[in-house]
């Protein structure tokens, strides 16, 4: 079980996550399992492409937000982390790594500067950043 210290370094307040519940998993060792998703927060800073490669090397992808209900623990995430959302300049849409389009009412997109990659921030915010800027990142693996 993850220590409270570890969780407090990731979240804005103490988060109760039933890490050992039988319905959740399997996940890679030391990953957080929550509502049939595995999450890992990596605190080394990489650009978006390196972050994507790191997740892929662990048989995962960068964070995909698909449900505020199933992913409610993300409400409390501290700081900014790369997620798997990129801007498609040709049609102006936002697309996940798997090619699916961002559904409305999942994220609030905030463009701070010109960029095509998105950082996840608490309460379902996506801050747009230059893809070559180093940042921490979140990997995710679906268990079902």
């Amino acid at each position: 079980i993850w220590s409270a210290v570890f969780l407090n370094s990731l979240f804005n307040q103490e988060v109760q996550i039933p890490l050992t519940e039988s319905y959740c998993g399997p996940c890679p060792k030391n990953w957080i399992c929550y509502k049939n998703n595995c999450y890992q927060f990596f605190d080394e800073s990489k650009n978006w492409y390196e972050s994507q490669a790191s997740c892929m090397s662990q048989n995962a992808s960068l964070l995909k937000v698909y449900s505020k209900e199933d992913q409610d623990l993300l409400k409390l995430v501290k700081s900014y982390h790369w997620m798997g959302l990129v801007h498609i300049p040709t049609n102006g849409s936002w697309q996940w790594e798997d090619g699916s389009i961002l559904s409305p009412n999942l994220l609030t997109i905030i463009e701070m500067q010109k960029g095509d990659c998105a950082l996840y921030a608490s309460s379902f915010k996506g801050y747009i950043e230059n893809c070559s800027t180093p940042n921490t990142y979140i990997c995710m693996q679906r268990t079902v």
């Epitope: 961002l102 409305p104 609030t108 921030a121 309460s123």
Partner: antibody, heavy 122, light 107 residues
């Protein structure tokens, strides 16, 4: 109906701080960002920043970075804007305004407070 | 940051006239352009959001069009109560920025 009610006029000395409040009603407070916009006498509108009342995330205009602090109290559905190190150029009417969200972007302001006049004078 | 250039800065027209104000952004802002009306001593009011959508309760004589960097605001038939200053504002990128305003007067 949506209402934003701001605190009363303030007179401050240079170097002091001012804290303006904006009490929201008629909608779910934590579902909408709140902006702060100011208007100096005879001048246009100037965006100062915005706050997401569902948490403590803020975005400030670079011009005000380090001098402005936006906070909120969810128990009273009130947002606050504090501006420090006041100078005469900060004399203005300060408005809070609720953000419009289209499912992707918060891009405009649909309801505005009545404004709070802040006068900075020695 | 994105600069919003509004023109003209002031205009005078007769009741019933068609009035047009333009707003140009220094970068592509898609359709994230809003128009506000401000009467002297009052708070601004949203008239049009997302380039062309009329805010609730706003008369249909107000309209907006454009995309990318060039936008237009139109009052199809100017009324005495339309005397005000009108502002455009972009909401695509931080910081949110306003045009300098257009003061509309009756001849």
């Amino acid at each position: 109906q949506v209402q934003l009610v701001q605190s009363g006029a303030e007179v401050k000395k240079p170097g002091a701080s001012v804290k303006v409040s904006c009490k929201a009603s008629g909608y779910t407070f934590t579902n909408y960002w709140m902006h702060w916009v100011r208007q100096a006498p005879g001048q246009g509108l100037e965006w100062m920043g915005e706050i997401d009342p569902s948490d403590i995330y803020t975005n400030y205009a670079q011009k005000f970075q380090g001098r402005v602090t936006m906070t909120r109290d969810t128990s009273t559905s009130t947002v606050y804007m504090e501006l420090s190190s006041l100078r005469s150029e900060d004399t203005a009417v300060y408005y809070c305004a609720r953000g419009i969200y289209d499912g992707y972007y918060v891009y405009g302001m649909d309801y505005w407070g009545q404004g709070t006049t802040v006068t900075v004078s020695s | 940051y994105i600069q919003m250039t509004q023109s003209p800065s002031s205009l005078s027209a007769s009741v019933g006239d068609r009035v047009t104000i333009t707003c140009r952004s220094s970068q592509d802002i898609s359709n994230y352009l809003n128009w506000y009306q401000q009467k002297p001593g009052k708070a601004p009011k949203l008239l049009i959001y997302y380039t062309s959508r009329l805010h609730s309760g706003v008369p249909s004589r107000f309209s907006g069009s454009g995309s990318g960097t060039d936008f237009t605001f139109t009052i199809s038939s100017l009324q005495p109560e339309d005397i005000a200053t009108y502002y455009c504002q972009q909401g695509k990128t931080l910081p949110r920025t306003f045009g300098g305003g257009t003061k509309v007067e009756i001849k």
